[in-house]
């Protein structure tokens, strides 16, 4: 996990809110865990950050992620008249200047240092999945979600016409 004291004191002050020229609706500092209660952790290795999915020891502190919420028109805008509604989108930042990115070519989720405006690869459509869970769909690749594969985060294609268990794309957000 990050050994950066600033992470736990993460506030809006660390982020100017001009991402893609829009201000977030709100921001939320939370720990991220899987449906099976494994923690998402971030480690600095060889000057780059790695993302892990692991069981924490009893009193080990969970890493926090700053979620910035945005509203966005549905990309397909199927109706053509805006009635399709606005989606909630998020960016996820575990430490200053670093954001989760979707690498669609490698089907991987990576932490990139980047400047504003953030690229579309840093934005995820937030899905409500009952049982206090959410899912993160790539803005750049509809139908592709952040998921867990081999104790790492990966991009997973979800076919809504398939009847499959989606537990590996379910995440819990917690303030503790």
């Amino acid at each position: 996990a990050f050994g950066i004291s600033g992470v736990q004191k993460y506030t809006r002050a660390l982020h100017d809110s001009s991402i893609t020229g829009i201000s977030p609706i709100t921001e939320y500092l939370a720990s991220l865990s899987t449906y099976n209660d494994q923690s998402i952790t971030f480690a600095l290795e060889d000057e780059s950050y790695e993302i892990y999915v692991e069981d924490l020891k009893k009193d080990e502190k969970k890493d926090k992620v700053l979620l910035s919420y945005y509203e966005s028109q549905h990309p397909s805008n199927e109706s053509g008249d805006g009635v399709d509604g606005k989606m909630l989108m998020v960016t996820l930042s575990p430490t200053k200047d670093f954001w989760l990115h979707a690498n669609n070519k490698e089907h991987s989720v990576e932490l990139h240092k980047c400047e504003k405006p953030l690229p579309d690869q840093a934005f995820f459509v937030l899905h409500n999945m009952h049982s206090n869970c959410v899912s993160f769909e790539c803005k750049t690749d509809p139908g592709v979600f952040i998921g867990v594969k081999d104790n790492h985060l990966a991009l997973i294609k979800v076919d809504s016409s398939e009847n499959l268990c989606t537990e590996n794309i379910l995440f819990k957000l917690s303030e503790t």
Epitope: A30, H74, D84, L173
Partner: antibody, heavy 121, light 111 residues
Amino acid sequence: EVKLEESGGGLVQPGGSMKLSCVASGFTFSNYWMNWVRQSPEKGLEWMAEITLKFNNYSTHYAESVKGRFSISRDDSKSTVYLQMNNLRAEDTGIYYCARRNYGDWYINVWGAGTTVTVSS
Amino acid sequence: DIVLTQSPTSLAVSLGQRATISCRASESVDKFGMSFLNWFQQKPGQPPKLLIFVASSQGSGVPARFSGSGSGTDFSLNIHPVEEDDTAMYFCQQSKDIPYTFGGGTKLEIK
């Protein structure tokens, strides 16, 4: 044009059954959670039932007052959602709206015009 | 269940003035750092129409005259300046927990 059209309402006796249908058009039906909401002068707007997507195993949720009596289902090939209502009571009288949640499933943003159900002897 | 109490049950506002409708929840409707409180407008013979979602975000195509605020248990819908066409019933609704619940409604008349 995004549209929801309910049918199947009418007059039914207490204890009777009725099946409501709602046909959707103008959007990819299989991508959206669907709901039934009813409205009566006595109880106002009441959420009744919800059905999720195929990849959520079509999980369903119900208001306590209709659990065990009402059943929501969908047929994605027909872009239709149904509400099977059994053991109907006088208090089930009202306008029944079919409603679609937004993409991402945070709020209802498309409603049908409604169909009226009257439970009376 | 989360109970939503709206006030007032009816109000009459002069054209061009401000209308404020309150909605109080029996417990917090906050989750994931957001407030899952929506506002709907309903005119006679029509289904409800979404105005505001997650407490303060405007629905698609909703005029800027409509704004929402609040968090936790206390919320309000503001309409300013009110227009003739705003005569309607207004409902708050929570989408945090099942069963999703609605407020009892507020009838707005324009003087």
